[in-house]
Amino acid sequence: QFLKEGQLAAGTCEIVTLDRDSSQPRIEERSQTARCACRKGQIAGTTRARPACVDARIIKTKQWCDMLPCLEGEGCDLLINRSGWTCTQPGGRIKTTTVS
């Protein structure tokens, strides 16, 4: 299976860096977004703190921890009302992500 330049393999994501207009103060010059080529039944999500194609059921049911959003070695817990998740590091530090 050969891919054209710029074409993503099915089920993969890549991080794209966008250059901002440097004449605009207070706006970061570079920002990142994800470009995904998800298979049927998949939606772009987060796995191991990186963009990834995840099963659509995870998004529909809001079982965020099932997409393994935290880094290796971290624990994952759902927020109340399934509004997002927390990642707990071995040292106890907690990072919270909310889904809008």
Epitope: T47, D55, D66, L68, G75, T88
Partner: antibody, heavy 121, light 112 residues
Framework: QEQLVESGGRLVTPGTPLTLSCTAS????????MSWVRQAPGKGLEWIGI?????STDYASWAKGRFTISKTSTTVDLKITTPTTEDTATYFC?????????????????WGPGTLVTVSL | ELVMTQTPPSLSASVGETVRIRCLAS??????ISWYQQKPGKPPTLLIY???NLESGVPPRFSGSGSGSDYTLTIGGVQAEDAATYYC??????????????FGAGTNVEIK
């Protein structure tokens, strides 16, 4: 150090339910998928099933109804609902890792030493 | 139901030879294959994941290749300590139809 240890294997009579436990140390179970695999004496490996952080499960077609996987914050349990002599095997608990790139292609990066279950009259 | 056909069931090789073990999946598994080594009385240990990625600490004489439904584990310059049974594991987790994982039947490698 990240490790898994199974327990609960013993001699049981056919039809007597048995629950095996897998205790994790060195990592959070909530950050991984976990699986059970078994190996009958002198035979190959058989995948039984998987449990996700949400607590939902999937099983091999042959294992549906015969096994139940559940978990707590520190253990993953496997219940053999109605053991038969064909269930005599070493049962392994394994941590599932995923190669991110093509979705959740799966491999087992940490295994427990196994626990032996003997089903006999 | 995913079927992983592993060949050969057993083989005998001399130290330094190249050994190849093949696993054929009954459907396209998108590089969702891993390879394990198991010695008697021990749990399996991971060698290769994602078809061709070498697990940390595994000697580079082990390599994996393949795509679609056809995959190969190669041991280049086999050593005495490589005598073991080797298994492939194929499948994909959390797909729209759930998780389907299947082990190959195993290949027993004997070193002459």
């Amino acid at each position: 150090q990240e490790q898994l240890v199974e327990s609960g294997g013993r001699l049981v009579t056919p039809g007597t339910p048995l629950t095996l436990s897998c205790t994790a140390s060195g990592f959070f179970l909530s950050g991984y998928y976990m699986s059970w695999v078994r190996q009958a004496p002198g035979k190959g490996l058989e995948w039984i099933g998987i449990i996700y952080p949400s607590g939902s499960t999937d099983y091999a077609s042959w294992a549906k109804g015969r096994f139940t996987i559940s978990k707590t914050s520190t253990t993953v349990d496997l219940k053999i609902t109605t053991p038969t002599t064909e269930d005599t095997a070493t049962y392994f608990c394994a941590r599932v890792a995923g190669y991110v790139g093509y979705g959740y292609e799966t491999f087992f990066d940490i295994w427990g030493p196994g626990t032996l279950v003997t089903v006999s009259l | 139901e995913l079927v992983m056909t592993q060949t050969p069931p057993s083989l005998s090789a001399s130290v330094g030879e190249t050994v190849r073990i093949r696993c054929l999946a009954s459907e396209d598994i998108y590089s969702g294959i891993s390879w394990y080594q198991q010695k008697p009385g021990k749990p399996p240990t991971l060698l290769i994941y994602g078809a061709s990625n070498l697990e940390s600490g595994v000697p580079p004489r082990f390599s994996g290749s393949g795509s679609g439904s056809d995959y190969t584990l190669t041991i280049g310059g086999v050593q005495a300590e490589d005598a073991a049974t080797y298994y492939c594991l194929g499948g994909v987790t959390y797909s729209s139809t759930g998780t389907h994982l299947t082990f190959g039947a195993g290949t027993n490698v004997e070193i002459k």
